[in-house]
């Protein structure tokens, strides 16, 4: 039975040209995290594998930085980066947990961080 929950940074905003950290945290389970995938809609951004370390998708390697931890740092943000981001935790023996973050990239300096929220 899957008992874990994913806590994410929730709805966040950032300024164009700036950077943002996407973070998820898996709690309430003793399952072992074997891999975390970061995806934007249906596009793979990065993978962090417990054995192999990071795989950054070639099309993002110049502006995606691994970490901190299992998180992901997006740099040189553009308005096109606005949208949904997903952290997909592969665990043993539970299976897969998914967290969602919505990022809004703003033209001006009105960017403000949203509240954290949980996805069971």
């Amino acid at each position: 039975m899957m008992t874990g929950t994913i806590e994410t940074t929730g709805n966040i905003s950032a300024e164009k040209g700036g950077s943002i950290i996407l973070q998820c945290h898996l709690s309430s389970t003793t399952a072992q995290v074997t891999q975390v995938n970061w995806e934007q809609q249906d596009q793979l951004l990065a993978i962090c594998n417990a054995d192999l370390g990071w795989h950054i998708s070639p099309s993002f390697k110049d502006r995606v930085a691994p970490g901190p931890g299992l998180g992901l740092t997006l740099q040189s943000l553009t308005v096109n980066d606005t949208g949904e981001y997903f952290c997909i935790y592969h665990t043993y023996p539970d299976g897969t947990y998914t967290g969602r973050i919505f990022l809004e990239v703003l033209e001006s300096s009105v960017a403000e961080h949203g509240a954290r929220f949980q996805i069971p």
Epitope: L44, L52, H55, P58, S59, K61, P93
Partner: antibody
């Protein structure tokens, strides 16, 4: 066109070292991780290790830790695999292989370098 | 380490036949499995990754399926150029092991 061109065949004595090169072209070298895989005569495929050309960070198969060393020269878009303390069981074809865009599989391979270890 | 079991080790078939090769893993690897084709004296060539995604330029007669621990590579109608050795590989963790290979021969 993506190409991985490897150095020529080598004959080495037991206990010696060998360094195989893999020159990449047709893509941005630092955007893709590089792996090394070997195949003994008539046998299957065995993964040796992986290197990030940007940072030089490496990961190795436990079977090769301490004996295999992976390096890159970004200025020439070349990856290297050095294997030390050679023994007859290291006789094999050694391949460099580029990591795919969506995970830890291999989308392009070099033509292979035959390394023969014989006294 | 996750163990890979590929079967059969060899297979005789005729042009036009439908052929299936299976790969089983000792633990759940989700869909992180690739298939390669290798011809004598040549480097392996990627056919399928993520269990069912086609590599560039791979003919549609090849297809991959499966998830978890059981995977298959199917060739719907064998062509003369398909006679080769096929390997599965899980791309989910060190040591990125390959299956033992399936040699596909002409009957």
């Amino acid at each position: 066109e993506v190409q991985l061109v490897q150095s020529g065949a080598e004959v080495k004595k037991p206990g010696a070292s060998v360094k195989v090169s893999c020159k990449a072209s047709g893509y941005t070298f630092t955007n893709y991780y590089m792996h090394w895989v070997r195949q003994a005569p008539g046998q299957g495929l065995e993964w040796i290790g992986r290197i990030d050309p940007t940072s030089g960070a490496t990961k190795y198969n436990d079977n090769f830790k301490g004996r295999a060393t992976l390096t890159v020269d970004k200025s020439t878009s070349t990856a290297y695999m050095e294997l030390s303390s050679l023994r007859s069981e290291d006789t094999a074809v050694y391949y460099c292989a580029r990591e795919g865009g969506f995970g830890y599989y291999f989308d392009y391979w070099g033509q292979g370098t035959t390394v023969t270890v014989s006294s | 380490d996750i163990q890979m079991t590929q079967s059969p080790s060899s297979l005789s078939a005729s042009v036009g036949d439908r052929v299936t090769i299976t790969c089983r893993t000792s633990e759940n690897i989700f869909t992180y499995l690739a298939w390669y084709q290798q011809k004598p004296g040549k480097a392996p060539k990627l056919l399928i990754y993520n269990a069912k995604t086609f590599a560039e330029g791979v003919p549609s007669r090849f297809s991959g399926s499966g998830s978890g621990t059981d995977f298959t590579l199917t060739i719907s109608s064998l062509q003369p150029e398909d006679f080769a050795t096929y390997y599965c590989q899980h791309h989910y963790g060190i040591p990125l092991p390959f299956g033992q290979g399936t040699k596909l021969e002409i009957k």
